[in-house]
């Protein structure tokens, strides 16, 4: 069964990424891309760290981890449908070809709301008025338009799904973590 | 490892019906919808429909509406389409296929099920 | 809905070659494309989604590019196993719509 990560639209998303220093301070570069790994670096990257610092990260990926013991989660800050896919995770080790990489994959739902007969995806059926709010592509921003007669109350239940729950505590055996020295 | 498995060929006559099945396995069922395709003899890909497995949501392609009727079975992980009033034009490989959940775009696919309509 | 076109219904290119393939869409899609290999006799595969992203295994001399209506597909250096016929969709609203395909042929 296939390992995914879940947060809801509107919700900070988390992608947990570990590894072990050699000793404290003894940091390796790390970045963060979406898309699958490739042979080399990542692509698109979002965020970089190098032996001392966050030196690159575009608006709304952060570190929210302590980075300087091996943790590089990454935290996705409000996210939207289009943030759904694969993001890679890269420890690069010095030396040839001694990278970790971590293919991690996200999935966001709709934002629960109510009445809500059927899943967000299927809004367009339930109320004609409206625009269909299932996921398509970068755009999506999840308004509900106009409904006068219904009173629409987004419900945010789930924040930070994954942190909140009971695997939270399982994270760093979850795979994407490694020792370095 | 997520597989989709699409039951085998067909050959049926003109004005009949066919029920073709897609059983999946490696993922929960429920949580994501399952996406009906179809593709004619030397053409590009159609999009059906798809069910939502949990609420039996079904959303449908206008231009080929009344065709296709999509169910699903939780207990056995199946999806089922049943097309009806086959004619030659609806003779084609028919795929069902998985989305990454809430986006539509497809990493999982069916083998594909030939189904051929002639007297 | 939302039209693909693929300009080129037929690509011929020599091994080790770079080649583009094309996909323009009736109306802006953001970057809400992604592109399908498909080999005689199978289903498609997915290679790129919104545009720009590779989808896991798939090899990096795969890239996609493009935002709004028009989008690229690329391989870097063409291989024998590249053979195939190559879709774009649009992943931006429902129904989700296919490009024609465009068959890379190896010369």
């Known amino acids: 069964s296939e390992v995914e990560y879940r947060a809801e639209v509107g919700q900070n998303a988390y992608l947990p990424c570990f590894y072990t220093p050699a000793a404290p301070g003894n940091l390796v570069p790390v970045c963060w891309g979406k898309g699958a790994c490739p042979v080399f670096e990542c692509g698109n990257v979002v965020l970089r760290t190098d032996e001392r610092d966050v030196n690159y990260w575009t608006s709304r990926y952060w570190l929210n981890g302590d980075f300087r013991k091996g943790d590089v989660s990454l935290t996705i800050e409000n996210v939207t449908l289009a943030d759904s896919g694969i993001y890679c995770c890269r420890i690069q080790i010095p030396g040839i070809m001694n990278d970790e990489k971590f293919n991690l994959k996200l999935v966001i739902k709709p934002a629960k709301v109510t009445p809500a007969p059927t899943r967000q995806r299927d809004f367009t059926a339930a109320f004609p008025r409206m625009l269909t709010t299932r996921g398509h592509g970068p755009a999506e921003t999840q308004t509900l338009g106009s409904l006068p007669d219904i009173n629409l109350t987004q419900i945010s239940t789930l924040a930070n799904e994954l942190r909140d729950s009971r695997l939270a505590n399982d994270l760093r055996d979850s795979g994407a973590t490694i020792r370095i020295g | 490892e997520v597989q989709l498995q699409l039951s085998g060929p067909e050959l049926v006559k003109p004005g009949a019906s066919v029920k073709m099945s897609c059983k999946a396995s490696g993922y929960t069922f429920t949580n994501y919808v399952m996406h009906w395709m179809r593709q004619k003899p030397g053409q590009g890909l159609e999009w059906i429909g798809y069910?939502?497995?949990?609420?039996?949501?079904?959303k449908y392609n206008e231009k080929i509406k009344g065709k296709a009727t999509l169910t699903s079975d939780k207990s056995s992980s199946t999806a089922y389409m049943e097309l009806s009033s086959l004619t030659s034009e609806d003779s084609a490989v028919y795929y069902c296929?998985?989305?990454?959940?809430?986006?539509?775009?497809?990493?999982?696919w069916g083998q594909g099920t030939l189904v051929t309509v002639s007297a | 809905d939302i039209v693909m076109t693929q300009s080129h219904k037929f690509m011929s290119t020599s091994v080790g070659n770079r080649v583009s393939i094309t996909c323009k869409a009736s109306q802006d899609v953001t970057t809400a494309v992604a592109w399908y290999q498909q080999k005689s006799g199978q289903s498609p595969k997915l290679l790129i989604y919104s545009a720009s992203n590779r989808y896991i295994g798939v090899p990096d001399r795969f890239t996609g590019s493009g935002s709004g209506t028009d989008f690229t597909f690329t391989i870097s250096s063409v291989q024998t196993e590249d053979l195939a016929v190559y879709y774009c969709?649009?992943?931006?609203?429902?129904?989700?719509?296919f490009g024609g395909g465009t068959n890379l042929e190896i010369k």
């Open positions: 296929a998985r989305d990454f959940g809430y986006v539509d775009w497809f990493p999982y």
């Open positions: 069910i939502d497995p949990d609420n039996d949501g079904i």
């Open positions: 969709q649009q992943h931006y609203s429902i129904p989700p719509t």
